[in-house]
Interface confidence: low
């Protein structure tokens, strides 16, 4: 007998064809011989099957000798052998309905596990293969698991169920809830205003939750909460903020924080956490602040940086349009008795300048000027 695979929730059309190309009497029954539907003249009649108003046919095809059975909103329990009785013949079609669902929710936090569960009719032995949006293939039986979801796992997962040499394809949209960047670093000169942005890597109609920014200043022995806030339908409202520094927060997404000014005592690392309503776990984004200060004290010109810099970063002091006078993989460099002119302090990574601060050194009889 013919085997047809169907998807839970979908519509399937089982065909039944008579040799006579005209409307004649037909009946569709299930394996228990319970009538599903049939015709009486040009009328469609329905039997007492559990398919009820989910069963239909196409009357427009009857005149061509085609008497399909359409089953809407398929359920696993609809898996059965369906018999079409027409012209003293019986056509049997075995319908196997499969369902593939993601564990609890299709919106998962980064780092969580995704479990795909296959619902299948009794007696079937399907195999499943799924392909992630980044091309990773996983195979399994009734359940497939992927641990430690990453941002790249967001998108459409395509799963193929194979049974009786026939296949049915499922597409499941998975949204990995995460910030666009796991970590970011901001480089600022002392005194400049600092902007921190925390864009999300997903969009949902309603976003509700609460968040907090904890800050570990390089100079401090312990971390402290700089700001706590609520998120209601994408509207941000500040619950509590420290007095020093007094952060400002944007009222709309993306989450946006403004530090009034960069100071050495603020340099360090922060961790913004966002707890979303109805989700276990939190979203995290690390943010780092590096602050530069250039000073001249008597006969000493000093350039310093505070905050999390990598050991390969180079700190240099040079007179404008001249070679670097001093260049070190350290957090402070200085020049004794600097000659007059515009000096540049540069923080660079493999030749790329990340931060620059200029200081004008005047002849020894006057005081220095910081532009």
């Amino acid at each position: 007998k013919k085997v047809v695979l169907g998807k839970k929730g979908d519509t399937v059309e089982l065909t039944c064809t008579a040799s006579q190309k005209k409307s004649i009497q037909f009946h569709w029954k299930n394996s228990n011989q319970i009538k599903i539907l049939g015709n009486q003249g040009s009328f469609l009649t329905k039997g007492p099957s559990k398919l009820n108003d989910r069963a239909d046919s196409r009357r427009s095809l009857w005149d061509q000798g085609n008497f399909p059975l359409i089953i809407k909103n398929l359920k696993i329990e609809d898996s059965d052998t369906y018999i079409c009785e027409v012209e003293d013949q019986k056509e049997e079609v075995q319908l196997l309905v499969f369902g593939l669902t993601a564990n609890s929710d299709t919106h998962l936090l980064q780092g969580q596990s995704l479990t795909l569960t296959l619902e299948s009719p009794p007696g079937s032995s399907p195999s499943v293969q799924c392909r992630s949006p980044r091309g990773k293939n996983i195979q399994g039986g009734k359940t497939l698991s992927v641990s430690q979801l990453e941002l790249q796992d967001s998108g459409t997962w395509t799963c193929t169920v194979l049974q009786n040499q026939k296949k049915v394809e499922f597409k499941i949209d998975i949204v990995v809830l995460a910030f666009q960047k796991a970590s970011s670093i901001v480089y600022k000169k002392e005194g400049e205003q600092v902007e921190f942005s925390f864009p999300l890597a997903f969009t949902v109609e309603k976003l509700t939750g609460s968040g907090e920014l904890w800050w570990q200043a390089e100079r401090a022995s312990s971390s402290k909460s700089w700001i706590t806030f609520d998120l209601k339908n994408k509207e941000v409202s500040v619950k509590r903020v420290t007095q020093d520094p007094k952060l400002q927060m944007g009222k709309k997404l993306p989450l946006h924080l403004t530090l009034p000014q960069a100071l050495p005592q603020y340099a360090g690392s922060g961790n913004l956490t966002l707890a979303l309503e109805a989700k276990t776990g939190k979203l995290h984004q690390e943010v780092n602040l590096v602050v530069m200060r250039a000073t001249q004290l008597q006969k000493n010109l000093t350039c310093e940086v505070w905050g999390p810099t990598s050991p390969k970063l180079m700190l240099s002091l040079k007179l404008e349009n001249k070679e670097a006078k001093v260049s070190k993989r350290e957090k402070a460099v200085w020049v004794l008795n600097p000659e007059a002119g515009m000096w540049q302090c540069l923080l660079s990574d493999s030749g790329q300048v990340l931060l620059e601060s200029n200081i004008k050194v005047l002849p020894t009889w006057s005081t220095p000027v910081q532009p």
Partner: antibody, heavy 118, light 111 residues
Framework: QVQLVQSGAEVKKPGASVKVSCKAS????????IHWVKQATGQGLEWIGE????????YSNAKFKDRVTITADKSTNTAYMELRSLRSDDTAVYFC???????????WGQGTLVTVSS | DIVLTQSPASLAVSLGQRATITCKAG??????????MNWYQQKPGQPPKLLIY???NLESGIPARFSGSGSGTDFTLNIHPVEENDAATYYC?????????FGQGTKLEIK
């Protein structure tokens, strides 16, 4: 908002036919089944049948099957119920109805009184 | 056809008291964990108004004084506390199988 507006009252002679209309608005007409329900004066409710406006597939109660035709016109968002070979016991109010989000009839027409009298 | 038998045929309840109407189906109307029974209120000259769907779900805009319960073949509609405005005829209806059928109705009078 969802509205079902039915045609006006009719007086018919026994043996004649009547065609009651039900104009839908406030939603996508082809997305929902339209049902027809009969209520004889002072009596209970009786389901006549239904139509899927998108496909034109209609199903009716065996009790009415030989005398009823349910149709729909997608261009005007209107469903029709025609009852033939009218008898005096067909005197009733005929309602069209539509399901809500659940399985019950959440939306109803105002009803059309059909009187069959010689 | 599934026959639905409502009882009582009529009842009179004092204002603020509880009204209980039962509906017995000729066969189970349960499927896949749901009970396909609905309840309606009808006042003279008006179409019926959906109160409860799938046995216990309150239709939007219906006060919580109305509640439905039951499964299989036995279902109940409760109104508590009864208000003057509740005087009407109440019908149960199964949406489990064609032909859809209604109970014969219960007339509620407020004392």
């Amino acid at each position: 908002q969802v509205q079902l507006v039915q045609s006006g009252a009719e007086v018919k002679k026994p043996g004649a036919s009547v065609k009651v209309s039900c104009k839908a608005s406030g939603y996508t007409f082809t997305d929902y089944v339209i049902h027809w329900v009969k209520q004889a004066t002072g009596q209970g409710l009786e389901w006549i049948g239904e139509i899927y406006p998108g496909s034109g597939s209609a199903y009716s109660n065996a009790k009415f099957k030989d005398r009823v035709t349910i149709t729909a016109d997608k261009s005007t968002n209107t469903a029709y119920m025609e009852l033939r070979s009218l008898r005096s016991d067909d005197t009733a109010v005929y309602f069209c109805a539509r399901r809500g989000n659940g399985t019950g009839f959440a939306y109803w027409g105002q009803g059309t009184l059909v009187t069959v009298s010689s | 056809d599934i026959v639905l038998t409502q009882s009582p045929a009529s009842l009179a309840v004092s204002l603020g008291q509880r009204a209980t109407i039962t509906c017995k189906a000729g066969q189970s109307v349960d499927y896949d964990g749901d009970s396909y029974m609905n309840w309606y209120q009808q006042k003279p000259g008006q179409p019926p108004k959906l109160l409860i769907y799938v046995a216990s779900n309150l239709e939007s805009g219906i006060p919580a004084r109305f509640s439905g319960s039951g499964s299989g073949t036995d279902f109940t509609l409760n109104i508590h506390p009864v208000e003057e405005n509740d005087a009407a005829t109440y019908y149960c209806q199964q949406s489990y199988k064609d032909p859809l059928t209604f109970g014969q109705g219960t007339k509620l009078e407020i004392k």
